[in-house]
Interface confidence: low
Amino acid sequence: SEVEYRAEVGQNAYLPCFYTPAAPGNLVPVCWGKGACPVFECGNVVLRTDERDVNYWTSRYWLNGDFRKGDVSLTIENVTLADSGIYCCRIQIPGIMNDEKFNLKLVIKPAKVTPAPTRQRDFTAAFPRMLTTRGHGPAETQTLGSLPDINLTQISTLANELRDSRLANDLRDSGATIRIG
């Protein structure tokens, strides 16, 4: 059964998915698709990585984490009710039927108040950094992703501000994780 994640209309939704690359720079292809994971590949692909790069993505779908270290969590920007549904994160491990498949259910709720887009963007860009720093060494050795500069005080402040929000609940550390190699 799929894990459920929630976001409000106008927010950025975060769908966690992780794996541990066997070696630095030796990545496993990953695809994200709308709809439950089929037998092979992803249906309705919204984003794809190969052994090196994010090589395909569509508008509003991003990887904000350090995908080179296995954080392939999906961010969906400025969600609408139509974004509700099942999403498939597929870690495409070489070999027949070796793929790891994770189905994540996204539930979009109507906005209670008018969202502040700029502020929301800052929040959702910050949290993936906080999560992906775990076990990855100091922030200055992180690889690319156009992440904002943020210190522990800012993270603590953001966490306090979001403690009671649905977003904070969505960011709980229960994402799909797999170790390879």
């Epitope: 630095p24 720079g25 030796n26 790069d53 920007e77 963007r121 690889t143 156009s146």
Partner: antibody
């Protein structure tokens, strides 16, 4: 055709600030990060930082924090770099360069803006 | 900051020569190594990315190789238009860093 258009030269007095522009065309501006690179005296290249126009998120080289501020105007597909408290050390050619999302290389470069700081 | 060293600052060669330019990283950069060409007028172009991938529109006489900390760019049959300065750049870690450049001149 992808183009990154920069002004050829700027002459500024020490202590002043300057805002260098980079107008992008030929692609969807928000689909790529815009990076800035410094080249002093025709020598090596130094990465200053980047801005992701889609998220307005930034990464800076620690060396240039407090010196450079990166911004974008999405309506005109233009990236800006403001340099403050200018000294002769800031005299250089400054390039804007396009970097694909998730990529680590710059696939298109502006022609560079030559900044001279002199009284 | 991860240092990138191009030990040869200038190199003289003749048209038709095979030229190799080297670049060394201070640590393993996992093949995240890119090469750029800068013409005398300041124009910069991407040649090779991820060590050995030829960028679109770049002539096949340019090839890249290497792994770990040691990388090289080879021009198999030097042409007049190749006279330029060549920079390597690591993309493994922020901040992105460049080599000092190797200026290629005609003998």
């Amino acid at each position: 055709e992808v183009q990154l258009q920069q002004l050829g030269a700027e002459l500024v007095k020490p202590g002043a600030s300057v805002k260098i522009s980079c107008k992008a065309s030929g692609y969807i501006f928000t689909d790529y990060s815009m990076d800035w690179v410094k080249q002093s005296h025709g020598e090596s290249l130094e990465w200053i930082g980047d801005i992701n126009p889609n998220y307005d998120s930034l990464s800076y080289n620690q060396k240039f924090k407090g010196k450079a501020t990166l911004t974008v105007d999405k309506s005109s597909s233009t990236a800006y770099m403001e340099l403050r408290s200018l000294t002769s050390e800031d005299t250089a050619v400054y390039y804007c360069a396009r970097r694909g999302y998730g990529k680590d290389y710059f696939d298109f470069w502006g022609q560079g803006t030559s900044l001279t700081v002199s009284s | 900051t991860w240092g990138m060293t191009q030990t040869t600052s200038s190199l003289s060669a003749s048209l038709g020569d095979r030229v190799t330019i080297s670049c060394r990283a201070s640590q393993d950069i996992s093949n995240y190594l890119n090469w750029y060409q800068q013409k005398p007028d300041g124009t910069v172009k991407l040649l090779i990315y991820h060590t050995s991938r030829l960028y679109s529109g770049v002539p096949s006489r340019f090839t890249g190789s290497g792994s770990g900390t040691d990388y090289s760019l080879t021009i198999s049959n030097l042409e007049q238009e190749d006279i330029a300065t060549y920079f390597c750049q690591q993309g493994n870690t922020l901040p992105l860093t460049f080599g000092a450049g190797t200026k290629l001149e005609l003998k």
